[in-house]
Every structure is written in C-alpha cells, then in structure tokens.
C-alpha cells in the first residue's frame, strides 16, 4: 500500500481467482484512543472499533472510503483504490491502446518546436468518475523539472456504437536548451483513477523524436508567363524554432489531382519555393520536416491550382 | 581551425548534411533477427553529447565557435572509432554496400576538415571498447546509430548556421 495523495491510498493486488489479497491496517488520524468506530462509504454498518482497523483487501468491494467516527463525529477518512496486476502486468483498462507508433501506446506526445513545450494526449471510452494527474521530468535518477498543466477533455468522437473521449495536457521543460543534443529523455507519468480503480501510464521520449512542425504558412502560387508552370512559395510556420538558419526545415511539395487515384508529383526542397506544373482541378500541398532529424512531417498546407 | 581560424563552413555544412542522410539510411540496420535481446549497454552511456554549455547555440557560435567545434570534433572521432569497432565489424556482418561504410568514411572526412593534419586539439579519451558479446551487437548498433543521428543533427545545424552567418 502507498499514499497517492493525502488520505488516498493505492493497494496493489495480484488479480486472479481466489487470490489472498493484501492485509491493510488503517489508522484513524486523531489523538483520541477510545470509542472509535469504522464504516465504509455510505454504509452505517460498523466494520470494527479502535484506533486501527485491519482489513483483507481482495476485490473492489473492499475498496472505497473508510471513515473513523467517535460519537457521531467524523474523525478522518482513508480512500482505498485498487491497482490490479494480472499475470505480472499492471492493468490498462482505463485508457485505450492507440496502437501508434506501436502496440501498448496509451500516451502520445508531440512538440511543435525545440522550446521544451509539448502536448500529450490519450483516449478513453469512460465518461464519468474519471480523474487524471500528470507529472513529468527530464531523466529519472536525477530528475530535472518539467511543469505540466491540468489534463482537460479536448475532444469527443463517436466510434461506431462507442463514444471516445480525448484528454490532453500541456507541459513545459523548466530550463529547456533548444540547441543541445538531448541525452536524457523526458518522462511523463499519468495517474488515472476511475471510480475505485487506479492505473498509471508512462511515456519516455526525447523532444527531437516527437517534433511535428505546424504546416507551412502563406502558401501562394504565382503563374509563370507562357507556361503551365507555377512558382509555389511559402513561409516557415510561426511556431517553429528560430533562427531558421540554425533550426532549418525541409519541405515536400505535392501536386495532387482531384481523384485520389491520379499520380502524385512530389518535389523535395530545402528552399521556401518551388516550380511545379499545375494541372487543371489539381491542388498543391506543402508540408515540412526538420531538415536534419527525421521526425514527423507536418500536416499539409494546400491551395487549389485554379 | 585550432588556434582560432575559421572552418570551411560551407564544406562542413555539406558534409554534415550528408552525414545526417547516411545516419538515417544506415538505421535501422537489417539484422538477421529482431532486437529481442534487450539490456542496457555501457557503450552508449559514454558517448559525447553536445550539451547546453558547449556553445553550439546561435549566440555561443557568434561569441566563440571554437568550444563548439572542439566538442563536435571529439564526437566525430568517438563515433568514427565506434563504427570501426567489433560492434560493427563483427558478426552479423554488414554487407559491403552498407551505408555504415560510407558513414564511417564521412565521419573521418568531417573530422579532418575540422582538424587538418598537423593541428591537434585535446581529444577526449575514447573509452576502451571491449568487444561486446556477438549477441549484443545488433542492439548496440541500433543504439549507437540512434545516438549518432541526434549528434549529427546538432552538428549539421551548427554548420548550416555558421555557413549562413559566420562565413567570411
């Protein structure tokens, strides 16, 4: 058993049929010694008396808010949550496996630049009685500070018969060094509580591996005289790290016909312009990627040819 | 470069950008099996990193690029030695046309651009690379190349910025 926060405790249980469970001793937080009784949740049934209560925690029915009283007055509470371990593996019932980039990916994180700011998100089908708490650090043995805000519900989607809820959190490394080569990964830890079930999820990454620039901005076309060619120009996104002579991007320019089956023409360039042939009813799209490190491409910025 | 002269920024930029491309094409190396054998290896803990105080940020480069260039040089020599060690020359064998061969040569090429014959910077002591057990080599290659990708990315940024702003 360990303390998650004040008066909230997590009991770690091996979860299998007829498991013996864990013996837990609760102590009433009071100077009183006599006349103390214990109850669980809303029930008025007295579970025991005395300053301590010993219980055998085996299942969710044994978890909940234990309260010690004296003469009708509440003295203190202890909320017991369960953390299940099945076949040596902690349960992951609360969050949905996003399966990207690999199986057992529950948390996904992205950064728009090298400033040390990043966003993580996760999915669940649970709509009520759900709380999240997020902590983060750079490295684990001698952790350096990363400050995370509160997790908020950022999107709701309907998937077949199910509703899916996306939560996200923003974090900022306290002393970020954008130009340095990271040697210690960022660690993100999410505590999830659904009713009386506790689970924790972690992710470990370097900022460089979760970079995804915003799409290029101010995408413009300039027809070239007496030609089907056009000059496409764009700019670095505002959110990208500066100076651009140091934090450089590379770009992919794509000409795509109306039909998805039509052949796509692609050009790669380090410049912020390119000359392409603009076909009728086609559109021109540009996306960006860090020039020197193959992290994610940005989403496309697009303009129609006409 | 040693003693304060300026490197051939544009040449360094071109070669460092080539190094980035090679480092990504060399990884993941197609081994004979999946990287099933996990386990942390000392070899990758000792790699030199370009850290915050090394002056490789735009301001540091403007003030005095020597500190940064020396750190980059140390790293290039370190990785060049790693790529020639048993980790990469032993079994499972890399094919003759593996990008690792080119990567190895390019690391040497860039380090020589930074430190021509006759000049000597204090080079960091290369840890003695005791031959890893053969079964550890694939995982080590994987880790070393991942680490090298990050190192050469920072080096390439440095040379790109230098070529754009510090070239005579």
């Amino acid at each position: 058993i360990w303390e998650l926060k004040k008066d909230v405790y997590v009991v770690e249980l091996d979860w299998y049929p007829d498991a013996p469970g864990e013996m837990v001793v609760l102590t009433c937080d009071t100077p009183e010694e006599d006349g103390i009784t214990w109850t669980l949740d809303q029930s008025s049934e007295v579970l025991g008396s005395g300053k301590t209560l010993t219980i055998q925690v085996k299942e969710f029915g044994d978890a909940g808010q234990y309260t010690c009283h004296k003469g009708g007055e509440v003295l203190s509470h202890s909320l017991l949550l369960l953390h299940k371990k099945e076949d040596g593996i902690w349960s992951t019932d609360i969050l949905k496996d996003q399966k990207e980039p690999k199986n057992k990916t529950f948390l996904r994180c992205e950064a728009k630049n090298y400033s040390g700011r990043f966003t993580c998100w996760w999915l669940t089908t649970i709509s009520t009685d759900l709380t999240f708490s997020v902590k983060s650090s750079r490295g684990s043995s001698d952790p350096q500070g990363v400050t995370c805000g509160a997790a908020t519900l950022s999107a709701e989607r309907v998937r077949g018969d199910n509703k899916e809820y996306e939560y996200s959190v923003e974090c900022q490394e306290d002393s970020a060094c954008p130009a340095a080569e990271e040697s210690l990964p960022i660690e993100v830890m999410v505590d999830a509580v659904h009713k009386l079930k506790y689970e924790n999820y972690t992710s470990s990454f370097f900022i460089r591996d979760i970079i995804k620039p915003d799409p290029p901005k101010n995408l413009q076309l300039k027809p070239l005289k007496n030609s089907r060619q056009v000059e496409v120009s764009w700019e670095y996104p505002d959110t990208w790290s500066t100076p651009h002579s140091y934090f450089s991007l590379t770009f992919c320019v794509q000409v795509q016909g109306k039909s998805k089956r039509e052949k796509k023409d692609r050009v790669f360039t380090d410049k912020t312009s390119a000359t392409v042939i603009c076909r009728k009813n086609a559109s021109i799209s540009v996306r960006a990627q860090d020039r020197y490190y193959s992290s994610s491409w940005s989403e496309w910025a697009s303009v129609p040819c006409s | 470069v040693p003693g304060g002269s300026s490197p051939a920024w544009t040449q360094c930029q071109q070669l460092s950008q080539k190094l980035c491309t090679l480092a990504w094409s060399a990884h993941p190396l197609v081994g004979h099996m999946d990287l099933r054998e996990e386990g942390d290896e000392e070899t990758t803990n000792d790699v030199p990193h370009i850290q915050c105080g090394d002056g490789c940020d735009p301001q540091g480069l403007r003030d005095n690029s020597q500190f940064c260039l020396q750190r980059i040089h140390q790293g290039l020599i370190f990785y060049e030695k790693l790529l020639g060690s048993d980790i990469f020359t032993g079994e499972p064998s890399l094919l003759p046309d593996s990008p690792v061969g080119q990567l190895h040569a390019s690391l040497l090429g860039l380090s020589q651009l930074l430190q021509p014959e006759g000049h000597h910077w204090e080079t960091q002591q290369i840890p003695s690379l005791s031959p890893s057990q053969p079964w550890q080599r694939l995982l080590l290659r994987f880790k070393i190349l991942r680490s090298l990708q990050a190192f050469v990315a920072v080096a390439a940024r440095v040379f790109a910025h230098g070529a754009a702003t510090l070239s005579p």
Partner: antibody
Framework: EVQLQQSGPELVKPGASVKMSCKAS????????IHWVKQKPGQGLEWIGY????????KYNEKFKGKATLTSDKSSSTAYMELSSLTSEDSAVYYC????????WGQGTTLTVSS | DIVMTQSPATLSVTPGDRVSLSCRAS??????LYWYQQKSHESPRLLIK???QSISGIPSRFTGSGSGSDFTLSIDSVEPDDVGVFFC?????????FGGGTKLEIK
Amino acid sequence: EVQLQQSGPELVKPGASVKMSCKASGYTFTRYLIHWVKQKPGQGLEWIGYINPYNDGTKYNEKFKGKATLTSDKSSSTAYMELSSLTSEDSAVYYCTSNWDLDYWGQGTTLTVSS
Amino acid sequence: DIVMTQSPATLSVTPGDRVSLSCRASQSISDYLYWYQQKSHESPRLLIKFASQSISGIPSRFTGSGSGSDFTLSIDSVEPDDVGVFFCQNGHSFPFTFGGGTKLEIK
C-alpha cells in the same frame, strides 16, 4: 573475388616460435574481423581468437592466451598469428577466416612441431 | 564455455535418403548457430548461418532449423558429393565453440 591466402607449411623444433600469415584480397580489409581456428589431424575445430584490422583490437580464447599473438598490417591487408613455445600439441592445420557468416576461409597452414 | 554436442558421431546413408544431424548447446544461444561442411583435405564451408538462413551457392537441399539450444541440419536428398564432416558452431558468445562433428558416409 574474395580470397584469404595463407602462408605455406612450417616444420619447426619444439620450443621455437612461428609466425604465419593470411593475406586478404577482394574486400576492404578493415571492414571485417579475422578469426583463427586450429584443427588437429582427424579432429574437430578450435577457435583461437580474432583481430579487428581496423583498430588492432583482439579477442582470445583463454586457452590460447600466451600461446597465440594476433597482429595485422593494414598496408598489406595481411593478418598474422605468432605461436610461441611450441610443442607437439601445437602440430595442426591453422585456418584464418573472416566473419563466420561470410564464409571466407584460407586454405590452411600446416604446422608440424618435431625435433 | 558453451559446449556444443553433435549426434550421431557417424551417419551412414544411401543416396536419396533424407537425413537429420543434431546439435545441442549447453545453454541457450538464441539463433546464433552456424553449420559447416568439411570435405577431406579442404577448408570448412559454411552451409547455414543463424540456425536457418541459407547461404548463396549452397544447394537448397541443406536446411537448418531450431532455436535456443536444440538445432537440426537436414539434407533433403543426400548425394554422393555430400560426404564429409559436418560441424555446428556457437556464434552467440565468447569463446566460440564447435561441436565434435558428424561424419557422413555413403553406403
């Protein structure tokens, strides 16, 4: 074509030393290890050790430490093995071979130790 | 050291037979196992690498299987030219060790 060409047979007296060579051609000498293997007449194979021609790093079978010394010369793409304090137990065919999974083997050097 | 044990020591077969040669390691070597054939007065020749990977130029009738500590070299339809001694080798950890060999004879 890849070839490992080994030096010719040796007949030496007990207590003496011998140095045999293995010249590589057809590939970049520093790209792969050179292993040495011992085979006594009508018997199995024993790994002696290897040298990495890139950095002259060596790895020995404990059994052959003090007996075998592996060296290489990049300029001539040649690996060498010196055997010291020879006894009749050292009479065998000695093979040089590049990485096991490449199947480059020398033709063997026959060593006879006899007074 | 990892001990490699081969069986049988000698195998006498008729051309066209399918034969299996066994190799056992004293501890797990994953799939870091090599098979060699050595004909009389010749250097060993690699037949199989990493337990089951074929080698170009080696007839397809030679196949390898196994992982961990038990390995098999199979010869689909033995030919008179297949005579020789077959060795297995641990390529997993130092020192590299060889099996004692299986001698293949044609009746």
